[in-house]
Structures are given as structure tokens and as C-alpha cells.
Interface confidence: low
């Protein structure tokens, strides 16, 4: 899968990014800052079906995802 559980030997969590994810299917969005484990920021989306996918933090698409999550959160309040 796109998310690796192996976090040893300076390896990143994300092996591949998913270019398209329906924001409605995202349950949780986690951002992992760059550090000794991985030299780049990583974004992991936990989907409502239990799967995890990685997103590119620089992708224009991700901004849309975050905005839609924020918008849906605001509507609930």
C-alpha cells in the first residue's frame, strides 16, 4: 500500500502519494513534520473505510481537501 509501517533507517512513512481523494471519505488528516526519520513533511489521510493514504503537502489538490474539511467542520458548529 501507499503507507509503509517501516520507520527505520531514515525511511519515510509515505512511499507514494495519492493524487485524488474525495474529501468526504477522509476521517482524519495527520501532518508529520520533517525530522530525523524523514527529511520531508508527510501528510497521511485516514479514510472512513479504514485505509490510509499519503497526500503531497505541496499539491494544489490538498489545499482543496483541507478547505473542504474545514468547511464541513464549520457547518457542524
Amino acid at each position: 500500500g501507499p503507507v509503509s509501517a517501516v520507520l527505520t533507517e531514515l525511511r519515510c512513512t509515505c512511499l507514494r502519494v495519492t493524487l485524488r481523494v474525495n474529501p468526504k471519505t477522509i476521517g482524519k488528516l495527520q501532518v508529520f513534520p520533517a525530522g530525523p526519520q524523514c527529511s520531508k513533511v508527510e501528510v497521511v489521510a485516514s479514510l472512513k473505510n479504514g485505509k490510509q493514504v499519503c497526500l503531497d503537502p505541496e499539491a494544489p489538490f490538498l489545499k482543496k481537501v483541507i478547505q473542504k474539511i474545514l468547511d464541513s467542520g464549520n457547518k457542524k458548529n
Epitope: 517501516v6 525511511r11 507514494r16 493524487l19 520531508k40 505541496e58 499539491a59 494544489p60
Partner: antibody
């Protein structure tokens, strides 16, 4: 700074094979994908495949399955491309490149390796 | 595979002129497009990624725009160093595919 140093020009016979190397420096090799691209005069740029050394993942263009094999030695931060059953169609400049983020745009490029197939 | 139609295939322009090169994808690639400059016997150099973002060290006279299927690279004021071949690349779908290139020369 990120650098990709490729092996030199090769003159090889038809039917033989060749291995091109791409030594990476200036970044954590196992964190990024290495991409290989072919360029022939008048044919533009063509994606061959890519490799993620951190997990041993490789993906190939349908056009290069059975032609190219991508490997890496993480201890020396070097990626390799092995080409077999060479013909004149394989005469080209081959570039390695590092992805910008995972399998996305090609941020940094090697200088290219010229392969000439001739009898 | 996604086909990238790049135009023009070649063009000539004067110093200081505004130059625009376009790429059209055969389907929506959602801004997963980058632009590369290549000079003879040299490796490609990244200019723009994600359709609009300027790569490190690239002069601000270069800019990218577009969305959906249609994208463009613009040089606001042509300099002699800009004579080269320019390629677009889509990476929204696998396999990544390049445009055929635009050869830019000075008038």
C-alpha cells in the same frame, strides 16, 4: 545541494546489454523516487520507469517492460538501469532524475548517459 | 495514456518579447503539470511545477498558468539565455507523459 552523477557514454553491440548508473548526493537517497527518462533525437522525452529504494518499489512503462530493469544500492546511494537485447532503437541519451515529492514532478536531473548501439 | 499536445512546435521571438507556450492534456490533470527547459546536449532543467509554482533558482520572468486540460508557460520578457527547447510533463496519471517540445529561437 542535490546532485545526480551518471556514468559515461557507452558504445555497445546489438543484442548485448548495458548498465547505466546514477549516483545521488545532497539528500537522503531512500526518501525519494528515482525516475529514468529516454531521449532520442526527434522523439522527445519518454518515461521509462521509476524506483523507490526505501521500499524496493519499481514501476515501468509498458514500453520498457522486459527491456529495462531498475535497481538501487542504498549503501552507495546509487541507482542503476540495466537494458537488455539492445537494438539501434535503444540508441539514446538516458537521464535519471529525482522526484520532487514521491512520484511527482522531476525536480533534479542527471547529466545524461549516451548509449550508442552499433555493430 | 494521457496525450500532451504542445504548441507551437517551434517559434522565434525577439529580445524583450513576451512568449507563451501551451500544452493541452487529453483529459483533466488537475494541475499536475510541470515545465522543463532543455538546451542542446544538456539535461532538462525544471522551471515550473504544479502548473504555477516556480522552481528554485528560476528567474521570475518565467510563469505558469492553467487548470483542467489547458496549461501555458509564459516568458514575460525574452532574454538570449532563454533559447532552448521547452517540454511540459503531466504526472496526474501514470504513466507520466511529456509534450513533444517547443523549440524557441531568437529572431
Amino acid at each position: 545541494q542535490v546532485q545526480l552523477q551518471q556514468s559515461g557514454a557507452e558504445l555497445v553491440r546489438p543484442g548485448t546489454s548495458v548498465t547505466i548508473s546514477c549516483k545521488a548526493s545532497g539528500y537522503t537517497f531512500t526518501n525519494y523516487w528515482i525516475v529514468w527518462v529516454k531521449q532520442r533525437p526527434g522523439h522527445g522525452l519518454e518515461w521509462i520507469g521509476d524506483l523507490y529504494s526505501g521500499g524496493g518499489y519499481t514501476f515501468y512503462s509498458e514500453n520498457f517492460k522486459g527491456k529495462a530493469t531498475l535497481t538501487a544500492d542504498t549503501s552507495s546511494s546509487t541507482a542503476y538501469m540495466h537494458l537488455i537485447s539492445l537494438t539501434s532503437e535503444d540508441s539514446a541519451v538516458y537521464f535519471c532524475a529525482r522526484s520532487g515529492y514521491d512520484r511527482t514532478w522531476f525536480a533534479h536531473w542527471g547529466q545524461g548517459s549516451l548509449v550508442t548501439v552499433s555493430s | 495514456d494521457i496525450k500532451m499536445t504542445q504548441s507551437p512546435s517551434s517559434m522565434s521571438a525577439s529580445l524583450g518579447e513576451r512568449v507563451t507556450i501551451t500544452c493541452q492534456a487529453s483529459q483533466d490533470i488537475e494541475s499536475y503539470l510541470s515545465w522543463y527547459q532543455q538546451k542542446p546536449w544538456k539535461s532538462p532543467k525544471t522551471l515550473i511545477y504544479y502548473a504555477t509554482r516556480l522552481a528554485d533558482g528560476v528567474p521570475s520572468r518565467f510563469s505558469g498558468s492553467g487548470s483542467g486540460q489547458d496549461y501555458s508557460l509564459t516568458i514575460s520578457s525574452l532574454e538570449s539565455d532563454d533559447t532552448a527547447t521547452y517540454y511540459c510533463l503531466q504526472h496526474g496519471e501514470s504513466p507520466p507523459t511529456f509534450g513533444a517540445g517547443t523549440k524557441l529561437e531568437l529572431k
